[in-house]
Interface confidence: low
């Protein structure tokens, strides 16, 4: 049979290239010598030249690292000529999908993130949302998946533990009661963005929370 | 959140060129492949064809002679010119977004309908 | 190109009761790296398509549980497990291993 099963290749490899991927072959060369080509973007159209075949064996060669977050899958098409240049099978479809590796760190939509919230609220009052973005795969890998955390809070008045964040959304929340705007009229908080679901790169940035007067206080003549 | 929006003329006349415009908004272009799906009336959904931002193309063989499909990362917009048309490229012609790799689309514009007509 | 072919054609059902729709490819769709590359659709009436399954089996961002999409390589199944009045409209299922991406015919869902 004329076939290939689907290829995977890590993004970033170290080499050496050129690398061998797999084989084609036509069931044809008993009868006759087969020529291998491959076109297709990656071969023939832009970005020529990723791939290549050995004319006469059939190896698909990779011919330089591969960037999943530039092109994660690449179709290419397999032919089979005999020495008279005639198509002896049609062409065939090689896929091959880019795995990815943890090469990008989460960034944070915004350095400084704002937010308001009335003092004297209850805890489990929703503040604010804060955003990271992450250019790796959070599909088939934890390597695009990001948690957040809060590193520190300033002031630590009347605790340090005033605010909590949902790992997976980001959303801050009021863990404690006590906000009292006449006291702390704002917080700053350290906020992490760290990939691998937790477990890799971290990158920070800052969250303010404005403590919203409730008019809680009498007049005092 | 990430929306897109097609824009372009509703009627075409036969022999000329179907151009549309995908617009989106709310998220950037980068790092995604950018489809046209079309759907004729009361029928099914075709895949036309998609672009990567980083500017590769892919076309449906049966439209592939008459289709391109390019990318402005500047305006955060990709666009759709088909020519030649005909009576049986009237249709729903909706832009859609796919993941990096994983090719489901997740993101749709409402569509816009073309009646090719002279 | 790899055909997709949908059953039935058209699928009365009972709200809360289970709703299932078949799609078979005419070539296998399991990707080496583990994943099936199918996905499937709603398109309510006078609505865009939107993502319900993709994978095969994993369900898109918001797309309730009663959802469920299981299958391998040339067969698989959408399951509804009780049907609501808001699931009409019409199923379609996709392949994304090789273009050109192909849909089936679809599976009008609408209530008795």
């Known amino acids: 049979d004329w076939v290939v099963a689907p290829i995977s290749v890590p993004e970033n490899g170290k080499g050496p290239f050129p690398q061998r991927l797999n084989q084609l072959k036509s069931n044809k060369d008993r009868d006759t010598k087969i020529f291998y080509s491959i076109t297709g973007p990656g071969a023939d159209s832009p970005p020529e030249g990723v791939f290549a075949v050995e004319k006469e064996t059939g190896w698909l060669l990779l011919n330089k690292p591969l960037d999943r977050e530039e092109i994660a899958k690449y179709e290419l098409f397999g032919h089979a000529v005999s020495e008279n240049g005639a198509s002896v099978e049609d062409p065939m479809n090689i896929s091959i999908i880019v795995t990815d590796q943890n090469d990008h760190k989460p960034k944070f939509t915004q350095d400084t993130f704002r937010g308001s919230v009335l003092e004297g609220v209850l805890p489990g009052t929703s503040v604010m949302q804060v955003t990271a973005t992450d250019e790796d795969d959070a599909i088939y890998t934890y390597n695009g998946v990001v948690a957040y955390s809060i590193h520190s809070q300033e002031p630590k008045d009347p605790h340090d533990l005033m605010f909590t964040i949902h790992r997976s959304t980001g959303t801050i929340s009021v863990i404690s009661s006590g906000l009292d705007r006449e006291k702390v009229p704002e917080y700053t908080l350290t906020i992490q963005a760290t990939d691998m679901d937790g477990d890799g790169s971290t990158t920070t940035a800052v969250a303010v929370v404005e403590i919203l007067d409730a008019n809680d206080n009498a007049p005092m003549f | 959140q990430v929306q897109l929006q097609e824009s372009g003329p509703g009627l075409v006349k036969p022999s000329e060129t179907l151009s549309l415009t995908c617009t989106v908004s709310?998220?950037?272009?980068?790092?995604?492949?950018w489809s046209w799906i079309r759907q004729p009336p009361g029928k099914g959904l075709d895949w036309i064809g998609y672009?990567?931002?980083?500017?590769?193309?892919n076309y449906n063989p049966s439209l592939k002679s008459r289709v391109t499909i390019s990318v402005d990362t500047s305006k955060n917009q990709f666009s759709l010119k088909l020519s030649s048309v005909t009576a049986a490229d009237t249709a729903v012609y909706y832009c859609?977004?796919?993941?990096?790799?994983?090719?489901?689309?997740?993101?749709w514009g409402q569509g816009t309908m073309v009646t090719v007509s002279s | 190109d790899i055909v997709m072919t949908q059953s039935p054609l058209s699928l009365p059902v009972t709200p809360g009761e289970p709703a299932s729709i078949s799609c078979r490819s005419s070539?296998?769709?399991?990707?080496?790296?583990?994943?099936?590359?199918l996905d499937w659709y709603l398109q309510k009436p006078g609505q865009s398509p939107q993502l319900l399954i993709y994978?095969?089996?994993n369900r898109a961002s918001g797309v309730p549980d009663r959802f469920s999409g299981s299958g391998s390589g040339t067969d698989f199944t959408l399951k509804i497990s009780r049907v609501e009045a808001a699931d009409v409209g019409v199923y379609y299922c996709?392949?994304?291993?090789?273009?050109?991406?192909?849909f089936g015919g679809g599976t009008k869902v609408e209530i008795k």
């Open positions: 709310g998220g950037s272009i980068s790092s995604y492949y």
């Open positions: 672009i990567y931002y980083s500017r590769t193309t």
């Open positions: 070539q296998s769709l399991l990707h080496s790296y583990g994943y099936n590359y």
């Open positions: 996709m392949q994304a291993l090789q273009t050109p991406l192909t």
């Open positions: 859609a977004r796919a993941r990096n790799g994983i090719d489901a689309f997740d993101i």
């Open positions: 994978l095969g089996s």
